[in-house]
């Protein structure tokens, strides 16, 4: 599932190349392992912002699929309460390209620990 999430992120990156979306997104670029689920939640919430701002059907479907895949992969530990983690709004705002690169990094963390 996580490998498919990375495929979806690459697809989103390709799709937004042709668009001019100036959004800055809350981005966790240095994820601590004890906060990875919280960070993943922030990434997924921000991904929905990309979908809504783009107004593009393909991006919308890909984001929705990515959320479904991530949900299923995290169904066993998605409700773990992680303490001492940053709120999404406390994270640094970065452009979409940097956001997607950081997203791939956190997904790779999940792949490495699964």
């Amino acid at each position: 599932n996580w490998v498919n999430v990375i495929s979806d992120l690459k697809k989103i990156e390709d799709l937004i190349q042709s668009m001019h979306i100036d959004a800055t997104l809350y981005t966790e670029s240095d994820v601590h392992p004890s906060c990875k689920v919280t960070a993943m939640k922030c990434f997924l919430l921000e991904l929905q912002v990309i979908s809504l701002e783009s107004g593009d059907a393909s991006i919308h479907d890909t984001v929705e699929n990515l959320i479904i895949l991530a949900n299923n992969s995290l169904s066993s530990n998605g409700n773990v309460t992680e303490s001492g983690c940053k709120e999404c709004e406390e994270l640094e705002e970065k452009n979409i390209k940097e956001f997607l690169q950081s997203f791939v990094h956190i997904v790779q963390m999940f792949i490495n620990t699964s």
């Epitope: 939640k41 997924l44 929905q48 479907d61 929705e64 959320i67 949900n71 169904s75 066993s76």
Partner: antibody, heavy 122, light 112 residues
């Protein structure tokens, strides 16, 4: 008023195939994910398949995975369910349903068609 | 898979009296983004299912306000404040937080 009309049901032998259709009207079909749900005679509801708005992504339970294929033709406002290798336990009324988007805050099957009966028997 | 368990399976109610149906999931159905995708459907005899409640407590358009949904995590409830004759049928809870999406077994509401 949203309209969904399922058709294509009938009697088929075990191992056979059938294709169901669901004609949609009175809404912008391409803006919605769609699902199929079935109900065996006298039994409860079972989710069968879901397809994304553009048709690129599909989801199934293990009970039908590899045998059933959900697809759509947005130019014809029509949803399909191709059912292969049918078994007696696939006998049911099949309903098509419209899905509200997860991203716009819903993610629920808000409107349902009237259903079409599939009977698998020799 | 998430198993949805409803109780009671049969619910005889006097007209005008309240009714309550419970639905319990085998694991939390709060998804990673914090949403709980729990719906309630009504199926009247001989009819297609009809959406009543989505995301635990949101009433769908056209649904009378005597229907309400509540709950969180793994425990959910559908309440009818005053049962009317047209409420007869089977009620299903449904989770679509995690694939495969799953229904409860159904609760048959009948008039005493």
């Amino acid at each position: 008023e949203v309209r969904l009309m399922a058709s294509g049901g009938g009697l088929v032998q075990p191992g056979g195939s059938l294709r169901l259709s669901c004609a949609a009207s009175e809404f912008t079909f391409s803006n919605y994910a769609m699902s199929w749900v079935r109900q065996a005679p006298g039994k409860g509801l079972e989710w069968v398949a879901t397809i994304s708005r553009g048709g690129d992504y599909t989801y199934y339970p293990d009970s039908v995975k590899g045998r059933f294929t959900i697809s759509r033709d947005n130019s014809k406002n029509t949803l399909y369910l191709q059912m292969n290798s049918l078994r007696a336990e696939d006998t049911a009324v099949y309903y098509c349903a419209r899905r509200v988007s997860m991203i716009t805050g819903g993610w629920a099957m808000d409107y349902w068609g009237q259903g079409t009966l599939v009977t698998v028997s020799s | 898979d998430v198993v949805m368990t409803q109780s009671p399976l049969s619910l005889p109610v006097t007209l005008g009296q309240p009714a309550s149906i419970s639905c319990r999931s085998s694991q939390s159905i709060v998804d990673i983004t914090g949403n709980t995708y729990l719906e309630w459907f009504q199926q009247r005899p001989g009819q297609s299912p009809r959406l009543l409640i989505y995301k635990v407590f949101n009433r769908f358009s056209g649904v009378p306000d005597r229907f309400s949904g509540s709950g969180s995590g793994t425990d959910f409830t559908l309440k009818i404040s005053r049962v009317e004759a047209e409420d007869v049928g089977v009620y299903y809870c449904f989770q679509d937080s995690f694939v495969p999406y799953t229904f409860g077994q159904g609760t048959k509401l009948e008039i005493k």
